[in-house]
């Protein structure tokens, strides 16, 4: 998170001859694995099932659409984002049950946790992408029939991991390994040692870029959006909306704890008993962001089912009705139904 | 009392081995680690490694690892430490330290207790 | 590795004065344990180092109470609260957080 992984140790996992005695007491330590990481290790198992399956039947089912339709490019970059994150999963998982050793060397340590943050910031920003796609449909039609093609929108999805990329990079490079003398153990973390404005620098960064701001606008844009499609007949558009605002919203609640945890963090001295009972839930906070990974497939398979009523086709046919939708090509340009939609809405409104 | 007796000084040619000793009295040798640090003439203090008596466990700072060699004989009650390929620079005075696993409010073997009187090792050709 | 560092490098003191050295280490000695392993040793003249303070600011038996440590983190500072000849010498810090264990380059406590 924003400071070293400073949890209770244990040396139970140690070679025999590694150890002084089972029995020999060590300061403030612990032969059992606590509650919350226990339980981030449920979470993260979890996750790793649901995320890696449901995420590469995501980039399946969309993969194939995205040349065409601009929808399947939005889920299409998502479902990379997450896919990526679920990866790190393993080895993650093996550190918490390890009792956060780290045997996976300096390199590791500074790409694997960092994915996370990639998928995080990579996330938000496709989710502001694609939140002001909706809006621009809604809002600005013909704009969207003269200019909203699939190359525009594969160089937003450029924009957003290139500046994903760029926001995880202080974290990235703050990220050490350390081996403790005793119990003998390598940890892996953010070490910003004499430089506590910066630690606070990169944390409150974090808070409002990659959760504040975001939340703020996307609030906004989604009010006018949903104002708008209240005030009009239901149209095919609908489903996309209510599948991108609940993306968004599981967005902001799995990523609420960590974010939360992440700034207190940062303002608390590393010796202090609050800063000691956060870092003892860091595995739980990051775990429970991760949720981010595998949530999405989820919300398009219940989304899935609610427009067909039941789950009478395949996933993947199911997947694709919700990912991606027919495109209509009139006058050589290609666009949604849901454009076309929206683009006659609003000529019976003028 | 705690005792920590060191051989005596060494003369030795670049390029050889030593071989230090360190004799425990006092208290119970495999009950403690031992520590090893080596101290350059009006310098600071390094840290060469330690050595679990009990199990024969050894820890090495990796700047001693290929040259330190630690080793404890439980009969006698005596850590050793071997140096080789000696250099000008491994001229210096080096102590055993012993480390307790628990002292007052702390459990682990965290600081040197007791030190030996030091054993000074000279490096000439 | 950690490095320790120490100042002042000297200290000429007269007795009964208070003296204050410094100690900082290029990373956190919190050990993930919450503790900070950072002790403080005095070598006399021609002898071994002898250990005063361990864990920052537990005092070591025998050692008088006029010797106090604080800290935390990165940075620690031993004090002494009236200076006596017996504690004139080289004040060494050391961390046993990390590996390898490190000492600070000392500083004398000597007589103005």
């Known amino acids: 998170m924003n400071s070293f992984n400073y949890t209770t140790p244990d040396y139970g996992h140690y070679d025999d001859k590694d150890t002084l005695d089972l029995n020999t007491p060590v300061d403030k330590t612990s032969n059992t694995l606590r509650v919350p990481d226990i339980l981030a290790l449920v979470i993260f198992a979890v996750v790793f099932l649901v995320g890696v399956l449901g995420n590469a039947l995501v980039v399946w089912v969309t993969a194939f659409e995205a040349k065409r339709t601009i929808n399947a490019i939005w889920f299409l970059n998502l479902a990379v984002a997450d896919f990526l994150s679920c990866l790190a999963l393993p080895i993650l998982f093996t550190s918490i049950v390890q009792h956060h050793h780290w045997p996976f060397g300096g390199a590791a340590c500074s790409i694997l946790p960092s994915l996370i943050l990639l998928n995080m910031y990579a996330s938000i920003l496709l989710l502001a992408t694609i939140s002001a796609d909706r809006f621009l449909l809604v809002f600005k039609p013909i704009w969207c029939q003269n200019f909203r093609g699939a190359g525009l929108a594969w160089i937003a999805c450029a924009v957003a991991w290139g500046l994903a990329l760029l926001l995880t990079i202080p974290s990235f490079l703050y990220r050490v390994v350390r081996e403790e003398y005793f119990p003998p153990k390598v940890l892996c973390g953010v070490d910003y040692s004499h430089d506590k404005r910066r630690e606070r620098a990169v944390a409150i960064v974090r808070l409002v870029l990659g959760f504040l701001w975001p939340l703020l606008t996307l609030t906004i844009c989604y009010t006018f959006i949903l104002l708008r499609t209240w005030s009009r007949r239901a149209t095919r558009s609908t489903k996309t909306l209510k599948v991108v605002v609940a993306v968004v919203a599981s967005f902001f609640i799995f990523w609420l704890p960590y974010q939360v945890t992440g700034i207190m963090m940062s303002f608390l001295e590393p010796s202090s008993p609050t800063f000691l009972l956060l870092n003892k839930l860091d595995s739980l906070c990051v775990s429970f962001a991760y949720i981010n990974c595998c949530i999405n497939p989820i919300i398009y398979v219940v989304a899935g089912q609610g427009f067909q009523g039941r789950l009478r086709k395949s996933l993947p046919s199911l997947l694709r009705n919700v990912l991606t939708e027919e495109s209509v090509v009139r006058e050589s340009k290609s666009f949604t139904r849901s454009t076309v939609d929206t683009m006659a809405q609003k000529t019976q409104a003028v | 009392q705690v005792q920590l007796q060191q051989s005596g000084a060494e003369l030795a040619k670049p390029g050889a081995s030593v071989k230090l000793s360190c004799k425990a009295s006092g208290y119970t040798f495999t009950s403690y680690w031992m520590h090893w640090v080596k101290q350059r003439p009006g310098q600071g203090l390094e840290w060469i490694g330690y050595?679990?008596?009990?199990?024969?466990?050894?820890k090495y700072n990796q700047k001693f690892k290929d040259r330190a060699t630690l080793t404890a004989d439980k009969s006698s009650s005596t850590a050793y430490m071997q140096l080789s390929s000696l250099t000008y620079e491994d001229s210096a005075v080096y102590y055993c330290a012993r480390v307790p696993l628990s002292y007052g409010s702390s459990y682990g073997p965290y600081f040197f207790d007791y030190w030996g009187q030091g054993t000074t090792l000279t490096v000439s050709s | 590795d950690v490095v320790m560092t120490q100042t002042p490098l000297s200290l000429p003191v007269s007795l009964g004065d208070h003296a204050s050295i410094s100690c900082r280490s290029s990373?956190?000695?919190?050990?993930?344990?919450?503790?900070?392993?950072l002790h403080w040793y005095l070598q006399k003249p021609g002898q071994s180092p002898k250990l005063l303070i361990y864990?920052?600011?537990n005092r070591f038996s025998g050692v008088p109470d006029r010797f106090s440590g604080s800290g935390s983190g990165t940075d620690f500072t031993l004090k002494i609260s009236r200076v006596e000849a017996e504690d004139l010498g080289v004040y060494f810090c050391s961390q046993s957080t990390l590996v390898p264990l490190t000492f600070g380059s000392g500083t004398k406590l000597e007589l103005k």
């Open positions: 050595i679990n008596p009990s199990s024969g466990y050894t």
């Open positions: 864990k920052v600011s």
């Open positions: 990373q956190s000695l919190i050990h993930s344990n919450g503790n900070n392993y």
